[in-house]
């Protein structure tokens, strides 16, 4: 049943919005898709969740949400924001999730983000961001998840990432990034998931992934790589690797030597002709291996230490005989 307090809470619900108690004597407020052009003014101080997405809000004034010290999630996605001023999020001491995707931002709102010390998740995807200032995330010490996909970035904002040592997942997909320099993610030792798919990446620094000691998922699909990404060799915890739909012609010997935890490798839609015989050795977690059209393969791959394959597909190769040990190597 509802307590007297929840009745008081619901009396602080803005017109046309949907409000409900969140179970902790705080209020969830949904004002999404109402055609609003400005923020509602009579918000309860006890609001913990505020959804203003899919409206027509084109600007935020400084300090537009005064006293919402319990607000943990603010959704402003799908509006018409081109700029967010300094002080827009002042006083939001509990804010953990900030959604600003599908707006028209051209820059990361550096000044507005300062001092959001509790922020854990920041969505800036599907904007027009072409530049990420060096210090723009410097106060976000709790940030765990960062979305920067579907923007207009042409390079990795290396300096901006240096302060994000707690970051666990990041996507930079669907941008126009062409190169990843050495140590691009050098301080992101907690990062587990990194999405770089659908860019224009044609070259990788030899040490571009150095420092990513926790990385488990790396997505390089749909890029312009023409060489195997040997920089992955420092990723000792990598479990899932994608580099399909690139222009890679060969997989070298000992290709995955530093990645013994790999479970999944997606590399279809590459013009792969050559595969080093030792390329897929010592991958005990690998379940599926598909090599189609690798016309320069003349010997069956050496699968020593890759003992748990459940599916092996080899087509278009020039293999004339199978080694006697092949049945011993596979389960």
């Amino acid at each position: 049943g509802s307590s007297p307090r929840s009745g008081v809470l619901l009396r602080g619900c803005p017109t046309h919005c949907h409000c409900e108690p969140d179970g902790r004597m705080l209020l969830r407020v949904d004002c999404s898709d109402l055609g609003l052009s400005e923020l509602p003014s009579n918000l309860s101080v006890f609001t913990s969740y505020l959804d203003l997405s899919m409206n027509n809000i084109s600007q935020l004034l400084p300090n537009p949400l005064p006293s919402l010290r319990f607000l943990e999630e603010l959704r402003l996605a799908g509006n018409a924001l081109t700029y967010i001023p300094k002080g827009a999020f002042t006083g939001l001491y509990s804010l953990k999730v900030l959604m600003l995707q599908n707006n028209q931002l051209r820059h990361v709102p550096t000044e507005a983000l300062q001092n959001l010390r509790s922020l854990q998740s920041l969505r800036l995807d599907a904007n027009h961001i072409s530049y990420v200032p060096p210090s723009c995330f410097s106060g976000l010490h709790s940030l765990r998840h960062l979305w920067l996909d579907d923007n207009a970035l042409t390079e990795i904002p290396v300096q901006a990432f240096r302060s994000l040592s707690a970051l666990q997942a990041m996507t930079l997909a669907l941008n126009k990034i062409h190169h990843i320099p050495d140590y691009a993610f050098g301080n992101l030792s907690s990062l587990v998931v990194l999405h770089l798919h659908n860019n224009r990446i044609h070259s990788l620094g030899k040490k571009c992934f150095d420092g990513l000691h926790s990385l488990e998922t790396l997505d390089l699909n749909y890029n312009n790589l023409d060489e195997f990404p040997t920089a992955i060799r420092t990723l000792s915890n990598l479990k899932e690797l994608g580099f399909h739909s690139n222009n890679i012609r060969s997989i070298p010997e000992k290709a995955f030597v530093g990645n013994p935890s790999l479970i999944t490798i997606h590399f279809y839609d590459n013009p792969i002709q050559f595969v080093g015989r030792s390329a897929f050795q010592h991958l005990p977690e690998l379940r599926t291996l598909t090599l189609n059209g690798a016309s320069q393969i003349t010997e069956f791959p050496d699968l020593t230490g890759t003992a748990n394959l459940e599916s092996l597909t080899l087509t278009g190769a020039q293999i004339s005989s199978l080694p006697q040990t092949v049945c011993n190597q596979l389960p």
Epitope: P134, V158, P181, K206, K207, D210, R233, T234, K254, V257
Partner: antibody, heavy 118, light 111 residues
Framework: EVQLVQSGAEVKKPGASVKVSCKAS????????IEWVRQAPGQGLEWIGE????????DYNEKFKVRVTITSDTSTSTVYLELSSLRSEDTAVYYC???????????WGQGTLVTVSS | DIVMTQSPDSLAVSLGERATINCRAS??????????MHWYQQKPGQPPKLLIY???NLESGVPDRFSGSGSRTDFTLTISSLQAEDVAVYYC?????????FGQGTKVEIK
């Protein structure tokens, strides 16, 4: 605790070769580059080359390229530096070090003195 | 090769006073906003010890009296209040491009 332990001192004649080892422990061996640096008596530090253990990824200082080979053995977590055609000016303490944050050398072996003398 | 030049070659400072060491690179060692410049301390008979990485970042466990600054070609290591245990030779190093190169070293002594 990260540790790099090097092999003992060597005395070699000019023209000979020397192989110095560096055994790593306390971290994931294949995830960090190992660098080799030398220091002649009373002199400064000179970078020789680097390897990513377990792989064939190596880089050498052009000055040493024809005489130096850096290899690794993942089964023992050991990196080796081999220097051939030794000359008296190769007399130095040879250090291995781990390439840490942004390639800075965050852990060092204790050093191996190689003396080249006829 | 990038040449690293330290100044001065040696430095005598009173206990508790500030010590400043400069390092100049023959060309910029900055890349994507990062300065690939590091500082080390070496005491007699010991291997070097990392103090500062990327020009200004204090390595874990290093006392905060050590600080680094600079960018592109000009860098500084500062010991704000010299202690007896700081007597050593200090080296700068770049790893912007190989061959990675070190400065010739600066010897810090107590006046």
């Amino acid at each position: 605790e990260v540790q790099l332990v090097q092999s003992g001192a060597e005395v070699k004649k000019p023209g000979a070769s020397v192989k110095v080892s560096c055994k790593a422990s306390g971290y994931t061996f294949s995830a960090y580059w190992i660098e080799w640096v030398r220091q002649a008596p009373g002199q400064g530090l000179e970078w020789i080359g680097e390897i990513l253990p377990g792989s064939d990824s190596t880089d050498y200082n052009e000055k040493f390229k024809v005489r130096v080979t850096i290899t690794s053995d993942t089964s023992t977590s050991t990196v080796y530096l081999e220097l051939s055609s030794l000359r008296s000016e190769d007399t130095a303490v040879y250090y291995c070090a781990r390439g840490g944050h942004y390639g800075s050398l965050d852990y060092w072996g204790q050093g191996t003195l190689v003396t080249v003398s006829s | 090769d990038i040449v690293m030049t330290q100044s001065p070659d040696s430095l005598a400072v009173s206990l508790g006073e500030r010590a400043t060491i400069n390092c100049r690179a023959s060309e910029s060692v900055d890349n994507y906003g990062n300065s690939f410049m590091h500082w080390y301390q070496q005491k007699p008979g010991q291997p070097p010890k990392l103090l500062i990485y990327l020009a200004s970042n204090l390595e874990s466990g290093v006392p905060d009296r050590f600080s680094g600054s600079g960018s592109r070609t000009d860098f500084t290591l500062t010991i704000s209040s010299l202690q007896a245990e700081d007597v050593a030779v200090y080296y700068c190093q770049q790893n912007y491009e190989d061959p990675f190169t070190f400065g010739q070293g600066t010897k810090v002594e107590i006046k």
